[in-house]
């Protein structure tokens, strides 16, 4: 079952009989129009599909539309990663994949997209309206996350369209600054378009592209085609949470911290291209204790309820939830 996504391709009008000067004056409006159209283009898209053959089986596909190299992808359910959600899989471009029940198979589809198959029965099975979130860490963009879920009325075998829903992912000052520039540009563009009323309007021709990527890891699509993808934002809330959230706990114990003081929305800038970072030589790190980390693909060691990096003075209930419920 392949779901076709509508991708509007922006095409400037033909120059026609206009002279070079007239053509040149139209360059700026088209640049501005492209900015206006792509200004809200989300960095991450999420697609959720219920398999027709198995009603308890879900396929989650996520993609990153940024230009940087991806260093890590985290897939969670029940809410955003770290905000009440439970981690299902973590994918590293070089070091491998870690996944936890009920995730059955996580894999890279391209260098900028992944897929995850979930299966389960009973309590561990995802609900039809469960929210699934994908978080991409990349250089130099930083971390971006989007969530999606099946529409309540979805039939098995049908998939929700890619639903980009960024969650607190941009530096506030950056947003305001860029928004101001874009707003001015869009106003200016409208002014120019009003002056050129007699000229034909731009044609938006939808071209059909399949989001289904080949099974092998292929090169990411060109930035031009990535920038063309523009899907309206969709924020999806769900009251359905997995009944056995704690059993899917990725590291067996409480998370780093329970609830942190909230600051302004922030999108950190990555210092380096982690994805292209080679694995350090065996001698480059010295382990303080003999216990080994879990190898890629295996479950990490179980940690007791008291072994938290940031113990909370309010007691164990303050660290409630596998990933620190807000």
């Amino acid at each position: 079952m392949r779901t076709e996504a509508q991708v509007p391709a922006l095409q400037p009008p033909e120059p026609g009989l206009e002279g070079a000067m007239g053509h040149r004056t139209l360059v700026l409006p088209w640049v501005l129009l492209t900015l206006c159209v792509t200004a809200g283009t989300p960095e991450v898209w999420v697609q959720v599909r219920m398999e027709a053959t198995e009603l308890s089986s879900f396929t989650i596909r996520c993609g990153f539309l940024g230009s940087g190299s991806i260093s890590l992808v985290t897939v969670s359910w029940g809410g955003p990663n770290g905000a009440g959600g439970t981690t299902l899989a973590v994918l590293h471009p070089e070091r491998g994949i870690r996944q936890w029940a009920p995730a059955r198979q996580a894999r890279w589809e391209t260098q900028s997209s992944i897929s995850l198959i979930l299966e389960g029965s009973g309590a561990s099975s995802p609900c039809a309206n469960t929210t699934f979130c994908c978080k991409f860490a990349s250089f130099p963009e930083g971390s971006w996350e989007a969530c999606g879920s099946l529409p309540p009325s979805s039939d098995p075998g049908l998939s929700a369209p890619p639903t980009p829903a960024p969650i607190l992912r941009a530096d506030l000052a950056g947003i305001l600054g860029v928004s101001g520039v874009l707003l001015f540009g869009c106003v200016y563009l409208l002014h120019l378009l009003r002056r050129h009323k007699h000229r034909p309007a731009p044609r938006l021709q939808p071209s059909r592209t399949s989001p289904q990527a080949p099974r092998a890891r292929a090169w990411a699509p060109s930035q031009a085609s990535q920038a063309a993808l523009h899907v309206p934002y969709a924020t999806i809330n769900t009251s359905c949470r997995p009944a056995t959230l704690d059993t899917a706990h990725p590291h067996g114990g409480p998370s780093w911290w329970a609830s942190l003081p909230t600051h302004a929305a922030h999108r950190p800038q990555g210092p380096a291209a982690w994805a292209s970072t080679p694995i350090p030589a065996r001698g480059s790190f010295v382990s303080v204790e003999n216990g080994l980390y879990a190898q890629a693909g295996e479950r990490p060691p179980h940690t007791g309820p008291g072994l938290t990096l940031f113990p909370d003075p309010r007691g164990p209930r303050a660290m409630e939830g596998p990933l620190g419920v807000r």
């Epitope: 890590l72 070091r95 971390s143 942190l260 990555g270 890629a296």
Partner: nanobody, 121 residues
């Protein structure tokens, strides 16, 4: 979403000490490791300096073992890096990062903006 803010960087003479701090705020974090990474100008990749996972396991780079100590504030959302016996080669931009362990290495998913450490001879 977690926000990591470093502080404590600066200039110091060789043999001196600095203490870097990393304060976390925002949403709770879901990874299983956190640490300090550095990158000098012109270097092609970042180097793990010291990392700690949520079971308390600590790892240090060979070049800093015995001189640097990673720790966290008790009951506070702060990560520290105590840097003693600093050398000129320790001059770098130091980043606080949080992420997931893969094969024994902490792979950052979120990181701070960095704090500059300069050691003069």
């Amino acid at each position: 979403h977690v926000q990591l803010v470093e502080s404590g960087g600066g200039s110091v003479q060789a043999g001196g000490s600095l203490r870097l701090s990393c304060e976390a705020s925002g949403y709770s974090y879901s990874g299983d490791c956190m640490g300090w990474f550095r990158r000098a100008p012109g270097k092609e990749r970042d180097e793990g300096v010291a990392t700690i996972d949520n079971a308390g396991r600590i790892k240090y780079a060979d070049s800093v073992k015995g001189r640097f100590t990673i720790s966290h504030g008790n009951g506070k959302y702060i990560l520290y890096l105590q840097m003693n016996s600093l050398k000129p080669e320790d001059t770098d931009m130091y980043y606080c990062a949080a992420g997931w362990t893969f094969g024994g290495n902490c792979s950052p998913a979120d990181w701070g903006q960095g704090t500059q450490v300069t050691v003069s001879s």
